[in-house]
């Protein structure tokens, strides 16, 4: 009897694990084995697929094969007994495109009102994701064990802290990874649960803000109790995404160690140009608070978020406003390569009724104006970032008269 070739071959790739599954074509024939060959793009010869020769089941693992994961390959399978079936060819595929992201590893640490989450890829030193390790983002679902009401948190990194939790409460969570530039979203980790600790005697500092005065940064925060000492630490923001990096160490700001007030002042040259995280801790000599929520601190935005400069072209029923880069001293424009949004306030010169337009474009139309009427305009810039809301001061008001009727073109 002729052996039929197997059908419906499925290739499952999760991280660096390559699994093949197929259907037997003829269940009635016993003692059949199956073998695979593979072929790389641009080659004529077929090569035996190690790990998938003379298989008695309908599943095999060819993870040991060292493939270029970006190169297309083709597979074929046949059944073998005394004779062999014809080959069945599987559609060619590129391993990287087919690969799914496996569940990440998750390690939790509890504080009284926060949980620190350490996330790492499920496969250490993965070949599949070797070029993308730092591009992983993660999302999680967290719930109180007692209620089961889920909260989703998107767009987090390898080290994340969830704040504003209740003390002595068990929380459960699961995490999945994503490689968004390849449209890949992985599968969830197993559920991990942890109980937050008993409430700490000292709460962490709150409402941390950074401002610039002269050549210094001024860091301020709020605290519940008097007669405390505080310390401030900083970290390069990019290390959040690469906590395995040996540089992942929070460092002290020298002028902000053991300060007795709820602010500290340090020179701008303490930080090179870049993006940092800052955190503050309180102590009364005997007890220490947990660290505050981390704030993001961007030296360029802190130092140079200046009010926008704009020109107005007046028509009879509208203004066209053209926003340019703000000028530094010496009349050189400031290069702002972070995303900004513009708030434009305008009002009739004889009235206090202000109207507002918010726009991300740098050319804006202010509509529905009356002819031959003086209107005043001022503008400010805002950054668009979830962790860092920074606004410039308003520009000086500029007042212009609209043209007579019928000049709206």
């Amino acid at each position: 009897k002729n052996l039929k070739s197997p059908q419906k071959v499925e290739v499952d790739i999760i991280d660096d694990n390559f699994i093949l599954r197929w259907n037997r074509s003829d269940e009635s024939v016993g003692n059949v084995t199956f073998s695979f060959d593979y072929q790389k793009t641009g080659m004529d010869n077929w090569i035996k697929l190690s790990g998938c020769q003379n298989i008695t089941s309908t599943k095999c693992n060819f993870s040991s094969l060292k493939l270029n994961v970006y190169e297309e390959i083709k597979l074929r399978i046949r059944a073998e007994k005394e004779n062999t079936s014809s080959w069945y060819e599987v559609d060619s595929f590129t391993p990287f495109r087919k690969a799914q992201i496996g569940p990440p590893e998750v390690h939790l640490e509890a504080e009284d009102k926060a949980i620190v989450i350490h996330i790492s890829p499920g496969t250490k030193d993965s070949v599949m994701w070797a070029l993308d390790g730092l591009s992983f983002t993660y999302s999680l679902v967290i719930w109180k064990n007692s209620s089961g009401v889920e909260e989703r948190i998107e767009n987090i990194y390898s080290r994340h802290k969830i704040y504003k939790l209740s003390p002595e409460t068990t929380y459960c969570l699961k995490v999945k990874a994503a490689l968004l530039t390849s449209w890949k979203i992985g599968v969830y980790s197993p559920v991990h649960c942890i109980k937050t600790t008993v409430e700490n005697e000292l709460p962490p500092p709150e409402n941390i803000e950074v401002s610039v005065q002269n050549q210094n940064y001024v860091l301020k925060w709020d605290y519940t109790y008097a007669n405390m000492t505080f310390q401030v630490q900083w970290l390069h923001a990019f290390l959040k995404r690469n906590p395995g990096n040996h540089l992942y160490k929070w460092k002290q700001i020298p002028d902000c160690e053991n300060v007795k007030t709820t602010q500290c002042v340090f020179p701008q040259n303490v930080f090179q140009k870049g993006i940092y995280l800052l955190r503050v801790q309180a102590s009364d000599g005997n007890n220490t608070s947990f660290w505050s929520e981390e704030i993001k601190f961007d030296t360029e935005i802190q130092a140079f978020l200046l009010p926008p400069v704009f020109n107005i072209r007046s028509l009879s029923d509208s203004f066209h406003i053209y926003i340019g880069a703000p000028k530094q001293s010496g009349n050189t424009p400031v290069i702002q390569d972070y995303p900004l949004i513009y708030e434009i306030i305008f009002w009739e010169n004889t009235s206090n009724a202000e109207r507002k337009i918010i726009e991300k474009k740098t050319d804006v139309t202010v509509p529905n104006l009356k002819p031959l009427t003086v209107y005043c305009v001022k503008a400010r810039a805002h950054t668009m970032d979830e962790k860092l809301n920074k606004s410039s001061v308003f520009s000086d008001a500029v007042c212009e008269k609209t043209k007579p009727g019928n000049t709206s073109k």
Epitope: S135, T137, E154, N155, L180, F238, R241, D337, P339, I341
Partner: nanobody, 126 residues
Framework: QVQLQESGGGLVQAGGSLRLSCAAS????????MGWYRQAPGKEREFVAG???????NYADSVKGRFTISRDNAKNTVYLQMNSLKPEDTAVYYC????????????????????WGQGTQVTVSS
């Protein structure tokens, strides 16, 4: 904040067609691309199709040749034309925008984030 509004879902017979739309409003400064994912009951959310800021398209193997993704940049809208629908295409379809924080100013500082729509139900009956 970005809002994504999907529409076009519904009940259709096997072999039929649907066209999903997703309009993005709000501020997306450096969009990488827009795409569609789907989630069937009891299953993980899976990628369906994506189109990046140029015209590069990506499709899941299961929908290749049947589904077509397109986008209208002027309207900030992405479409998914679904033909030859099968019962296994039944799922909630989610629109997604992937964006980045723009030109990196410091080492390793380009990150990618995703915004999700609320989802639209597609049911294919046999």
């Amino acid at each position: 904040q970005v809002q994504l509004q999907e529409s076009g879902g519904g009940l259709v017979q096997a072999g039929g067609s649907l066209r999903l739309s997703c309009a993005a409003s709000g501020y997306i400064f450096y969009p990488f691309g827009m795409g569609w994912y789907r989630q069937a009951p009891g299953k993980e959310r899976e990628f369906v199709a994506g189109i990046n800021d140029g015209t590069t398209t990506n499709y899941a193997d299961s929908v290749k040749g049947r589904f077509t993704i397109s986008r209208d940049n002027a309207k900030n809208t992405v479409y998914l034309q679904m033909n030859s629908l099968k019962p296994e295409d039944t799922a909630v379809y989610y629109c997604a925008v992937v964006y980045t924080n723009g030109p990196a100013r410091t080492r390793g500082d380009n990150y990618y984030h995703i915004y999700w729509g609320q989802g639209t139900q597609v049911t294919v009956s046999s």
